[in-house]
């Protein structure tokens, strides 16, 4: 009896879905009460499937509503463990043990990343100086720095602070902001870029015509 | 910008040790897979083993297991490779490689240090 | 093991041409390859990832495509500086593997 796997290396984005998937022998009908199927990771139990039934009582609390054992996929010898609105925390050595008349086990390796995509912009102007203040701000992982630029390929310096997210203690959210005096219409662009060649995020920056001054500070 | 300084290569005698080092810097080390990637006399790239940014797993080939070790020390920035029953065959470059956020591939390459195992 | 095997293994050409470096997997891999260069005296760099994305900081001129078993690595117009080995890697199963290498060299 041996558990086969045509993918062991795993990489899904935070917050999307990922199905891992291990193969074992069926012949002819599977019989479910002879089927036993473990799914752990590290030391988290997740799936426990025992006599047709999974037992969610065993089931470590961080996987509670988001890991399941597609079922339908049994009875075509594929244990398939999805896992939804994946996490960072959710990176790791996954263990599928299959029992079936003899019994076996294979390691699956996933690995998650957030990458800087969702930047959010904003432009404000001090209305005493005209200097205008532009901030872009993202979360991912890991760690980003960010490059201010200009249309002309000039770059600029920015201030940048990273903390941790609210959403995820692993997350981080990382705000730039860049002090200029502009014109109307000028473009410039805040880059997040992790070390390393394999990607940059970047959020494009236009100078409105006019900005509206806050009400506060409206002369009349 | 992404170092990745190898050292403790030499010459050694077939059944003996070694331990490799690498100092990283320019990145957040404690956030990424590091490996040891070797490049033998004949050009041929082979990966070595790779541990977890927080180094709770390590992955090896299967004719590699039991011999070598992959090690970090995030506090130092600092990933090592201790080989020990070394054999000809394990003559190469090695080279310090830091693996990317979004897959497993090399980002990021040492300049390497030299391994020679010879009587 | 997922074997990989490069062809050419060596490849020579003039300056201005342009050329493919294939690389074919034993078993399906999706699109997991990458690719990288490596310069004589100096250690690889990364070209290509996941058969066709490219790295920043990487000319545009080098370009890859396939999915499955067999890829492509093109470079449109070879320039003096691409002269060297060239070496794809699945990362599709443990152990991730590398190809034997193309040598592209100067006709």
């Known amino acids: 009896f041996t558990i086969t796997v045509s993918k062991d290396l795993y990489v899904v984005e935070y917050g999307g879905n990922v199905t891992m998937e291990c193969k074992f022998p069926v012949e002819k009908q599977l019989n479910l009460f002879a089927l036993i199927v473990y799914w752990e990771m590290e030391d988290k139990k997740i799936i426990q499937f025992v006599n047709g039934k999974e037992d969610l009582k065993v089931q470590h609390s961080s996987y509670s509503q988001r890991a399941q054992l597609l079922k339908d996929q049994l009875f075509l010898g594929k244990a398939a463990l999805q896992i939804t609105d994946v996490r960072l925390q959710d990176a790791g050595v996954y263990c599928c043990l299959i029992g079936y008349g003899g019994a076996d086990y294979k390691r699956i390796t996933l690995k998650v990343h957030a990458p800087y995509r969702n930047i959010s912009q904003r432009i404000s102007v001090d209305p005493v100086t005209s200097e205008h203040e532009l901030m872009c701000q993202a979360e991912g992982y890991p760690e980003a720095e960010v490059i201010w630029t200009s249309s002309d390929h000039r770059v600029l310096s920015g201030k940048t602070t990273i903390t941790n997210s609210n959403r995820e203690e692993k997350l981080f959210n990382v705000t730039s902001t860049l002090n200029i005096n502009a014109t109307a219409n000028e473009i410039f662009y805040c880059t997040f870029q992790r070390s390393g060649p394999e990607e940059n995020n970047t959020a494009e920056l236009v100078i409105p015509e006019r900005l509206p001054v806050p009400a506060s500070e409206r002369t009349h | 910008e992404v170092q990745l300084v190898e050292s403790g290569g030499g010459l050694v005698k077939p059944g003996g040790s070694l331990k490799l080092s690498c100092a990283a810097s320019?990145?957040?080390?404690?956030?990424?897979?590091m490996s040891w990637v070797r490049q033998t006399p004949d050009k041929r790239l082979e990966w070595v083993a790779t541990?977890?940014?927080?180094?709770?797993?390590?992955h090896y080939p299967d004719n590699l297991m039991g011999r070598f070790t992959i090690s970090r020390d995030n506090a130092k920035n600092n990933l090592y490779l201790q080989m020990s029953h070394l054999k000809s065959d394990d003559t190469a470059m090695y080279y310090c490689?830091?693996?990317?956020?979004?897959?497993?591939?090399?980002?990021?390459w040492g300049q390497g240090t030299l391994v020679t195992v010879s009587a | 093991d997922i074997v990989l095997t490069q062809s050419p293994a060596t490849l020579s050409v003039n300056p201005g041409d342009s050329v493919s470096l294939s690389c074919r997997a034993s078993?399906?891999?999706?699109?997991?390859l990458h690719w990288y260069q490596q310069k004589s005296h100096e250690s690889p760099r990364l070209l290509i990832k996941?058969?066709?994305q490219s790295i920043s900081g990487i000319p545009s001129r080098f370009s890859g495509s396939g999915s499955g078993t067999d890829f492509t690595l093109s470079i449109n117009s070879v320039e003096t500086e691409d002269f060297g080995m060239y070496f794809c890697?699945?990362?599709?199963?443990?152990?991730?593997?590398f190809g034997g290498g193309t040598k592209l060299e100067i006709k």
């Open positions: 490689a830091r693996e990317s956020y979004d897959g497993y591939y090399v980002a990021n």
């Open positions: 320019g990145f957040t080390f404690s956030s990424y897979a």
């Open positions: 541990i977890s940014d927080g180094g709770s797993y390590t």
């Open positions: 078993q399906s891999i999706s699109n997991n």
């Open positions: 996941y058969a066709s």
């Open positions: 890697q699945q990362s599709n199963s443990w152990p991730q593997t």
